[in-house]
């Protein structure tokens, strides 16, 4: 058993049929010595008396809010949560496996630049009695500070018969050094509590590996005289690190016809303009990627090719 | 050229070669995200690798103030990786494919280090840790880790030279 936060405790249980469970001793936080009784949740059934209560925690029915009273007055609470371990593996029932970029990916994180600011998100089908708490640091043995905000519900989607909820959190490295080569990864830890179930999820990454620039901005077309060629121009996204002579992007320009079957023409360039051929009903799209490190491409910025 | 005396490097040449290094490093080990090498207990490799750190003056302001500190750090790293790529880790079994970009990568590391420090000038270099994995699978894993680490190193070096070519060239 360990303390998650004040008056909230996590009991780690090996979860299998007829498991013995864990013996837990609860102590009433009071200077009083006698006349103390214990109850669980809203029940008025007295579970025991005395300053301490010893219980055998085997299942979710044994978890919950234990309260010690004296003469009708509440003295203190202890909330017991369960953390299940099945076949040596901690349960991951609360969050959905996003399977990207690999299986058992519960947390996904992205950064728009090298400023040390990043966003993580996760998915669940659970809609109520759910809380998250997020902590982060740079490195684990001698951790350097990363400050995370509160996790918030950022999107709701219908997936077949189920509703899916996306939560996200923003974090900022306290003393970020955008130009340095990272040697210690960022660690992100998410505590998830659903009713009386506790789970924790972690992710470890370098900012450079989760970079995904915003799409190029101000995408414009300038037709060339007596030609179906156009000069496409764009600008670096506002959110990208500066100066651009140092934090450079490379770009992919694509001409895509109306039908997905039509062949795509693609041009790669380090410049912020390119000359391409417009086809009927085509659109021109541009996306960006760090020029020197192959992290994710941005989403496409698109304009119709007319 | 970046020499201990403090003259400027051939920024544009360095920019071109460092960008080529980035391309080669990624073609030598293109897998991103498929194999989380940090799960494989790699402290003995990466702890000894010379990283370009915050105080090394490789940021735009530091380069403007005095690019020598940064260039020396980059030079150390280039020599370090050049020696690693020429070591038994890469020359031993399992043999690299004949068309592997590692050979070109090795040559380009040497080329860039020579651009930064011509014959007759010496910056101190870092000792190469003795990494001699016994099993071919360990050697393969170590190659991946070294290449991942090299990708990060050359990315910073390429940014430095791109910025230098754009803002510090005479």
């Amino acid at each position: 058993i360990w303390e998650l936060k004040k008056d909230v405790y996590v009991v780690e249980l090996d979860w299998y049929p007829d498991a013995p469970g864990e013996m837990v001793v609860l102590t009433c936080d009071t200077p009083e010595e006698d006349g103390i009784t214990w109850t669980l949740d809203q029940s008025s059934e007295v579970l025991g008396s005395g300053k301490t209560l010893t219980i055998q925690v085997k299942e979710f029915g044994d978890a919950g809010q234990y309260t010690c009273h004296k003469g009708g007055e509440v003295l203190s609470h202890s909330l017991l949560l369960l953390h299940k371990k099945e076949d040596g593996i901690w349960s991951t029932d609360i969050l959905k496996d996003q399977k990207e970029p690999k299986n058992k990916t519960f947390l996904r994180c992205e950064a728009k630049n090298y400023s040390g600011r990043f966003t993580c998100w996760w998915l669940t089908t659970i809609s109520t009695d759910l809380t998250f708490s997020v902590k982060s640091s740079r490195g684990s043995s001698d951790p350097q500070g990363v400050t995370c905000g509160a996790a918030t519900l950022s999107a709701e989607r219908v997936r077949g018969d189920n509703k899916e909820y996306e939560y996200s959190v923003e974090c900022q490295e306290d003393s970020a050094c955008p130009a340095a080569e990272e040697s210690l990864p960022i660690e992100v830890m998410v505590d998830a509590v659903h009713k009386l179930k506790y789970e924790n999820y972690t992710s470890s990454f370098f900012i450079r590996d989760i970079i995904k620039p915003d799409p190029p901005k101000n995408l414009q077309l300038k037709p060339l005289k007596n030609s179906r060629q156009v000069e496409v121009s764009w600008e670096y996204p506002d959110t990208w690190s500066t100066p651009h002579s140092y934090f450079s992007l490379t770009f992919c320009v694509q001409v895509q016809g109306k039908s997905k079957r039509e062949k795509k023409d693609r041009v790669f360039t380090d410049k912020t303009s390119a000359t391409v051929i417009c086809r009927k009903n085509a659109s021109i799209s541009v996306r960006a990627q760090d020029r020197y490190y192959s992290s994710s491409w941005s989403e496409w910025a698109s304009v119709p090719c007319s | 050229r970046a020499v201990p005396g403090g003259s400027s490097p051939a920024w544009t040449q360095c920019q071109q070669l460092s960008q080529k290094l980035c391309t080669l490093a990624w073609s030598a080990h293109p897998l991103v995200g498929h194999m989380d090498l940090r799960e494989e207990g790699d402290e003995e490799t990466t702890n000894d690798v010379p990283h370009i750190q915050c105080g090394d003056g490789c940021d735009p302001q530091g380069l403007r103030d005095n690019s020598q500190f940064c260039l020396q750090r980059i030079h150390q790293g280039l020599i370090f990786y050049e020696k690693l790529l020429g070591s038994d880790i890469f020359t031993g079994e399992p043999s690299l494919l004949p068309d592997s970009p590692v050979g070109q990568l090795h040559a380009s590391l040497l080329g860039l280090s020579q651009l930064l420090q011509p014959e007759g000038h010496h910056w101190e270099t870092q000792q190469i840790p003795s990494l001699s994995p016994s099993q071919p699978w360990q050697r393969l894993l170590l190659r991946f880790k070294i290449l991942r680490s090299l990708q990060a190193f050359v990315a910073v070096a390429a940014r430095v030279f791109a910025h230098g070519a754009a803002t510090l060239s005479p």
Epitope: N226, R228, K280 | -
Partner: antibody
């Protein structure tokens, strides 16, 4: 910039015929080329085109009857099995724009070559 | 697509104005992929107007084009004897196979 059609002659129905348009002064890798015909005393009919990248398009009535192909300096129109209805002057015309759409304006035009199909 | 030209023939007096209409059975590509041609007997057609209203190089300014979508007009203001010819419109569409010429309008100058 010039175009000249050749290959027009008198043929019997069903005898395959290939017309050739020879171009000079511009590159077929940057221009779309069209074939148009005109029956005696009648209007213009667009047959089909080959675009700068080698893609072809045909009028719905012409599909299966005509095939357009090109080399670096020539554009061919093959008439698979001519009928008397195919008697006409055949023109080749360049797309006006560099990298023109099919259906863009045609300019310049060749002088035309006459095909007569008769038994 | 079917392009219908009206009227035909049309007679004009020197110095007068001639208006030829071209109606398309479907909207041309981007509302303006329509061109006009002049053809004299024994000659290939000559481009006059492209993109519905842009005058081709070397074409006298008495020729003008207008219209959008499915309805287009070629106007000859201050007709001259040399303008006696047959005029054709050509439409381009989303589907390349729909490319087609109008039936032609013969202009007779009296």
């Amino acid at each position: 910039q010039s175009l000249e059609e050749s290959g027009g002659r008198l043929v019997t129905p069903g005898t395959p015929l290939t017309l050739t348009c020879t171009v000079s002064g511009f590159s077929l890798s940057t221009y779309t080329m069209n074939w148009v015909r005109q029956s005696p005393g009648k209007g213009l009919e667009w047959i089909g085109a080959i675009s700068y990248d080698g893609g072809t398009a045909y009028a719905n009535w012409a599909k299966g009857r005509f095939t357009i192909s090109k080399t670096s300096t020539t554009v061919d129109l093959q008439i698979a099995s001519p009928t008397t209805e195919d008697t006409a002057t055949y023109f080749c015309a360049r797309g006006f724009y560099v990298y023109a759409y099919i259906g863009d304006a045609f300019d310049p035009w060749g002088p035309g070559t006459l095909v007569t199909v008769s038994s | 697509a079917v392009l219908t030209q009206t009227p035909s023939p049309v007679s004009a007096t020197v110095g007068g104005t001639v208006t030829i209409k071209c109606q398309s059975s479907q909207t041309v590509y981007k509302n303006n992929l329509l061109s006009w041609y002049q053809q004299k007997p024994g000659q290939p057609p000559k481009l006059l107007i492209y993109l519905a209203s842009t005058l081709a190089s070397g074409v006298p300014s008495r020729f003008s084009g207008s219209g959008s979508g499915t309805q287009f007009t070629l106007t000859i203001s201050g007709v001259q004897c040399d303008d006696a010819a047959t005029y054709y419109c050509l439409g381009g569409y989303d589907d390349d196979a729909d490319t087609a010429f109008g039936g032609g309008t013969e202009v007779v100058v009296v």
